[in-house]
């Protein structure tokens, strides 16, 4: 059937979800596409416990998550409500900084070296984490 009962090879199971940790970098949109082609989505962090799990696996490396504000408000790629949900921004972040000289601000969120979140230029080639839920029927992720 369409339900996933165990994690694919090379994915890590945790709390009824499967996680895949990249070892190379892509821009946020390209990482998002990669996850979608795995019938998954960029990781959506919904609790401190999940934050610690992901942080343990990625180490002190900038890593994309499924959070962006490319269309205005901050949104999680799976539709999880941002305003009422878990957040772990670094102090004074997100700041939509324009001083990087790359054009535009900063619209995509990533884990920083200490695990806390920062917004950054979406074109930066960071590692990323894909996530898919177990025991859920296949659903196409919402379009951005």
């Amino acid at each position: 059937g369409s339900e996933r009962t165990c994690c694919p090879v090379n994915w890590v199971e945790h709390e009824r979800s499967c996680y895949w940790f990249s070892r190379s970098g892509k821009a946020w949109a390209d990482a998002d596409n990669y996850c979608r082609l795995e019938d998954a989505h960029l990781v959506v962090v919904t609790s401190w416990e999940e934050q610690k799990f992901v942080q343990h696996h990625i180490g002190p490396v900038n890593t994309w998550m499924g959070l962006h504000d490319q269309n205005g408000p901050w949104k999680w790629v799976d539709g999880t409500d941002y305003e009422t949900g878990f957040k772990n921004w670094r102090p004074e972040q997100p700041d939509d900084w324009y001083g990087h000289g790359l054009g535009g601000g900063e619209d995509c969120a990533h884990f920083t070296d200490d695990g806390r979140w920062n917004d950054d230029v979406c074109q930066r080639p960071y590692r990323w984490v894909c996530e898919t839920e177990l025991d859920k029927a296949s659903q196409e992720p919402p379009l951005l």
Partner: antibody, heavy 120, light 107 residues
Amino acid sequence: EVQLLESGGDLVQPGGSLRLSCAASGFTFSSCAMTWVRQAPGKGLEWVSAISGRGGTTFYADSVRGRFTISRDNSKNTLFLQMNSLRAEDTAVYYCAKDLIGGATYFDYWGQGTLVTVSS
Amino acid sequence: DIQMTQSPSSVSASVGDRVTITCRASQGVNDWLAWYQQKPGRAPKLLIYDASSLQSGVPSRFSGSGSGTDFTLTISSLQPEDFATYYCQQANSFPWTFGQGTKVEIK
């Protein structure tokens, strides 16, 4: 042993339609993203389309978007490419290919190809 | 779209020669690059992925290197079965794109 076998290639008039199939065996088809790549006679390789294992996500080259549709039937281990509004420039050998490591990035197994000729 | 440019377009070499093919991307693709071998009338065969990882079953005389925009495929000692056309492919950003090919011919 992994096997991919394309079929459905034919001579068709411009504006016509064709449906290509790719029968897969030897691996867990429903877990694998799949891709179509084509090669015009005497030319190089051109990526056409990709689809996720469950079929929920698809991508297309600009040259075929809106005319071609990739799909799959995991119960029959078969990949499809529905080709509409065909043009002379779609003439090519069409290969289906299996994803190597995820994200439909690289292709470790290919079919033998099926020839599509668009001509009046 | 990212343009992939291979050089040379063809090379004449003898059995035992060291052959080097280069591939340049119009923008950085990190190490998201593969090399394929294709013989006439046959489907392509994956040789190298992630710029330098040797695909299972491929002889060790094939090697890949590079990152960013400049990549190299090297055949350390050309064998009779290596005469073919070689293509690079980037998998960093959709649409995936291939180089135009390099034909390795018998001198």
